[in-house]
């Protein structure tokens, strides 16, 4: 949760309440002034502080990869990065800045079309090869709508969930991601204790459905809190 | 015309629940993180839970932690507040808003009301001792 990573005061400090009267806030909300926390930098944006800690790509933002912050860190501990621009390395798309795709290592621009077959290229090819320079296809959601025209059924390559038909996620399998059922109740689920702990896994699974979250199996004792099974459980 | 419309609230004991529901159209809202935050009255509206454009990330206020759960349906554009245990403290009008996936994302970033591009126009939550 967000209380991890914040001390508990952040969240209580809000700024004041935006577009007009009390109880009938605007729906659009105009610019606003940047808010200054400790360390005066404009809507926490900073590469240094307050990293974001991530588990893949999707979750940080459109300018950013997820990964360890030092070369050859602990791959436990991943955050946020700012992207590669033109004519840095790269080991996959996701480092790349919208724009630009990794080719051979480099940062370089994108035309779409061309985009569009590396992409593909990469996908098939990542079922097979050295997987160091894998999930290149990873993510830059603007390109998801050109890339998909058709809601992805299960089994279907994707790129994030929206790519995938109703009650289907995008989820690791192997060294590619394809779309899969979303957790029904009673089946078991992932409950991840550190953040970025499931970037590792070959085999994802879904998070659970609608109105389910992701507990520890009530009967299920173990001596190891760490190997309890959890599964999807009503709220 | 983009709108977020809040259903759901009402008037309930404390040590009760409440389901409040989020339906955004005019736009797929698939890339934006969805949130709830809460004004009651004389107080600043503060951040309740949010969900990331993701699906796989949540965050919450410390004071609903392990009582309230945020989950959103993005096939229906929709995004729900599982709220149990409530408690007085709780009784507010909750609003659901919605914030783009930003280019740089930080810690804060879903807490700060400022982020938020568009809001609904609030369901009330009382909840009686």
């Known amino acids: 949760t967000l209380n991890s990573v914040l001390n508990s005061n952040a969240i209580k400090n809000l700024p004041p309440p935006l577009g007009g009267a009390a109880g009938h806030p605007g729906s659009a909300v105009s610019a606003a002034p940047g808010i200054l926390y400790p360390g005066g930098n404009k809507y926490q944006t900073i590469d240094n502080y307050q990293p974001y800690p991530c588990a893949e790509d999707e979750e940080c933002g459109t300018d950013e990869y997820c990964a360890s912050p030092t070369r050859g860190g602990d791959a436990g501990v991943q955050i946020c990065l700012a992207c590669r621009k033109r004519r840095k390395r790269c080991m996959r798309h996701a480092m790349c800045c919208p724009g630009n795709y990794c080719k051979n290592g480099i940062c370089v621009s994108s035309d779409q079309n061309h985009f569009r077959g590396e992409i593909e290229e990469t996908i098939t090819e990542s079922f097979g090869n050295d997987h160091s320079t894998l999930d290149g296809y990873s993510r830059r959601t603007t390109l998801s709508s050109k890339m998909y025209h058709t809601k992805g059924q299960e089994g279907s390559v994707c790129l994030r969930s929206s790519d995938c038909a109703s009650g289907l996620c995008c989820a690791r399998h192997f060294w590619s991601k394809i779309c899969k059922p979303v957790l029904k109740e009673g089946q078991v689920c992932t409950k991840h204790r550190r953040k970025g702990s499931h970037g590792l896994e070959i085999f994802q699974r879904c998070y659970c459905g609608e109105g389910l979250s992701c507990r520890i199996q009530k009967d299920h004792h173990q001596a190891s809190n760490s190997s309890r099974l959890h599964t999807c459980q009503r709220h | 015309e983009v709108q977020l419309v809040e259903s759901g609230g009402g008037s309930v004991q404390a040590g009760g629940s409440l389901r409040l529901s989020c339906t955004a159209s005019g736009r797929p809202f698939d890339n934006y993180a969805m949130a709830w935050f809460r004004q009651a009255p004389g107080k600043e509206r503060e951040f309740v839970a949010a969900i990331s454009w993701s699906l796989s990330r949540t965050h919450y206020a410390d004071s609903v932690e392990g009582r309230f759960t945020i989950s959103r349906d993005n096939a229906k554009n929709t995004a729900f507040m599982q709220m149990i245990s409530l408690k007085p403290e709780d009784t507010a009008v909750y609003y659901c808003?919605?914030?783009?996936?930003?280019?740089?994302?930080?810690?804060?970033?879903?807490?700060?009301?400022?982020?938020?591009?568009?809001w609904g126009q609030g369901t009330q939550v009382t909840v009686s001792s």
């Open positions: 808003a919605a914030a783009p996936r930003p280019k740089r994302v930080s810690v804060r970033y879903f807490s700060t009301s400022s982020n938020y591009d568009y």
